[in-house]
Interface confidence: medium
């Protein structure tokens, strides 16, 4: 059929609760382009009739709520002008209820139900909740070990809960609940989140400021040798490590035989108040398989890609 | 609205003491690094302290001519900027702005910048 | 200290003129330099930060450019309220250091 595939995610979600997923995918999802949602390769659309329990809404899929037989692979197809791109995502659902035991023993959570609060500091947990726009959700209540949190060291704010000088104790199971209205009719959706402490001095929470690449294309002939640059802004006493991976696979090591894609040694400059780093990766020769691959920019938990593709062929010379 | 009110200016005899203060309001400001920045009568701008937000630490910076006889500090909970000055020269004599730093360090560095002003007291040392 | 050298002084123009104000730093401060205006018992204002960045509410007549060393606050058509003067500022590195400020008075 012509469409790109394009291996996404991995999800591990709460049964008998909403989740929704955005198919974004910014390289493509920018301009003009159609979205359709499928589940484990139908041929038939996930529906977009508002009252069923899972439909489109928009360039979303929204599961209302989500059951324990919802778990596969759904794929989003982004169909632009000239490309067609499938990107599968792969939903886990498990029976979970939050005060029975530990998420400790989930696998591949994501950093959104994995937090860290920095010992002696102010800082603060995030309720990471992603629905479109047709859902309005309430205010957000926070518990932790299944009791209500309640005290003057912890503020709700929003999406987050502020918690001021963070103590040992703070470590544990948290979850934050909302109830979400769709449609008239009120879901209840509860996050779970392991907390664990640091002691790591510094600025607290900091996370690095990938300014280049943007998650974007850049367009290359087949055969040529390229450099791109990643340039990184960190605070100064920052501990975190930058690298260039593939494949969740670090270029060196994917590519350790043939060393046709290598990333560069890091340098950095040194400003007021941060540390601007650059490391930079070096295709020496492209070939057709580095087309539509993201190549991914680490710096911590942030993370930005670069993916090839082949120039718009230019008639004028004929 | 983004508001700075400094207060405490007025006449002092060199070699005393003047304490300012700058209520803030409008914005989160136990997120900002702050500032104190001076203006002589019919002069440049000349910068005077900085002190960081509590994520960095309370650091603080001061310029070569009040080291060590100027003192900035915070309350956080009051929303309150303060400058302790202390020896007073009659040099010191100048309209005393406190400005807000755009550089907040809330997860990674903002433009570096004085993007807000007081409307500035002023502080006169002479005998 | 960083030491920022801001030219000319003063100058002279009309409305509708096309303006260029010139900051110059000892060393290489990169591109954390900001303009600011300022009007006779007022407080300053930031016009332009990170050498090319519009503060809110900045007309876009205004511009600024440069890097490293050499900067430059252009106006592209002198308005009647834009006669004030302007500081740079460095904030590349403590102490923070201002020019000496150029005076834009009207011709």
């Known amino acids: 059929d012509g469409c790109k595939d394009i291996f996404m995610k991995n999800e591990i979600l709460s049964a008998s609760q909403p989740f929704a997923f955005n198919c974004t995918f910014p390289p493509i999802t920018s301009g003009e382009v159609s979205v359709t949602w499928y589940k484990n390769s139908s041929k038939i659309p996930v529906s977009k009739i508002i009252q069923s329990r899972i439909h489109q809404d928009e360039t979303w899929i929204l599961f209302l709520p989500m059951e324990w037989g919802d778990s596969g692979v759904y794929q989003c197809v982004i169909k632009g002008r000239d490309s067609c791109h499938r990107i599968h995502v792969n939903l886990t659902v498990f029976e979970k209820h939050w005060c029975d035991t530990s998420i400790g023993g989930l696998p591949n959570l994501s950093d959104e139900y994995k937090q860290i609060l920095h010992l002696g500091k102010d800082d603060s947990l995030t309720c990471h909740l992603h629905f479109p726009k047709s859902c309005v959700l309430g205010p957000i209540k926070w518990y932790k070990d299944c009791n209500e949190i309640k005290g003057e060291r912890f503020t709700v704010l929003e999406t987050r809960l502020l918690v001021s000088n963070v103590s040992a104790e703070d470590r544990g199971n948290y979850a934050c609940q909302a109830i979400l209205t769709h449609s008239g009719k009120q879901y209840e959706v509860l996050n779970g989140i392991t907390v664990s402490i640091t002691e790591r001095a510094g600025y607290g929470g900091s996370v690095p400021k990938i300014i280049y690449p943007k998650n974007h294309s850049i367009e290359v002939q087949l055969g040529t040798t390229l450099i791109v640059d990643c340039n990184v802004t960190d605070t100064k006493d920052n501990t975190n490590l930058r690298c260039w991976r593939v494949n969740n696979t670090l270029v060196d090591d994917y590519y350790d035989e043939s060393k046709r894609i290598r990333e560069g040694v890091e340098t950095h400059v040194s400003f007021r108040e941060h540390n601007l780093y650059t490391v930079n990766i070096t295709f020496l020769e492209v070939k057709m398989e580095d087309y539509g691959l993201p190549f991914m920019c680490h710096a911590g938990v942030s993370t930005a890609y670069i993916i090839l593709q082949l120039p718009a062929p230019d008639f004028r010379a004929y | 609205e983004v508001q700075l009110v400094e207060s405490g200016g007025g006449l002092v005899k060199p070699g005393g003491s003047l304490r300012l203060s700058c209520a803030a309001s409008?914005?989160?400001?136990?997120?900002?690094?702050m500032n104190w920045v001076r203006q002589a009568p019919g002069k440049g701008l000349e910068w005077v302290a900085l002190?960081?937000?509590?994520?960095?630490?309370?650091?603080?910076y001061y310029s070569a001519p009040v080291k060590g006889r100027f003192t900035i500090s915070r309350d956080d909970s009051k929303s309150t900027l303060y400058l302790q000055m202390n020896s007073l020269k009659t040099e010191d004599t100048a309209v005393y702005y406190c400005?807000?730093?755009?550089?907040?360090?809330?997860?990674?560095?903002?433009?570096?910048?004085?993007?807000?002003w007081g409307q500035g007291t002023l502080v006169t040392v002479s005998s | 200290d960083i030491v920022m050298t801001q030219s000319p002084s003063s100058v002279s123009a009309s409305v509708g003129d096309r303006v260029t104000i010139t900051c110059r730093a000892s060393?290489?401060?990169?591109?954390?330099l900001s303009w600011y205006q300022q009007k006779p018992g007022k407080a300053p204002k930031l016009f332009i930060y990170?050498?090319?960045n519009l503060h809110t509410g900045v007309p876009s007549r205004f511009s600024g450019s440069g890097s490293g060393t050499d900067f430059t606050l252009t106006i592209s058509s002198l308005q009647p309220e834009d006669f004030a003067t302007y500081y740079c500022?460095?904030?590349?590195?403590?102490?923070?250091?201002f020019g000496q400020g150029t005076k834009l008075e009207i011709k």
């Open positions: 400005v807000r730093d755009m550089t907040i360090y809330d997860g990674y560095y903002v433009d570096y910048a004085l993007d807000y």
């Open positions: 409008g914005f989160a400001f136990t997120d900002y690094y």
């Open positions: 002190i960081r937000n509590k994520a960095a630490g309370y650091t603080i």
């Open positions: 060393q290489n401060i990169n591109i954390w």
């Open positions: 990170k050498a090319s």
């Open positions: 500022l460095q904030s590349q590195s403590y102490p923070l250091t």
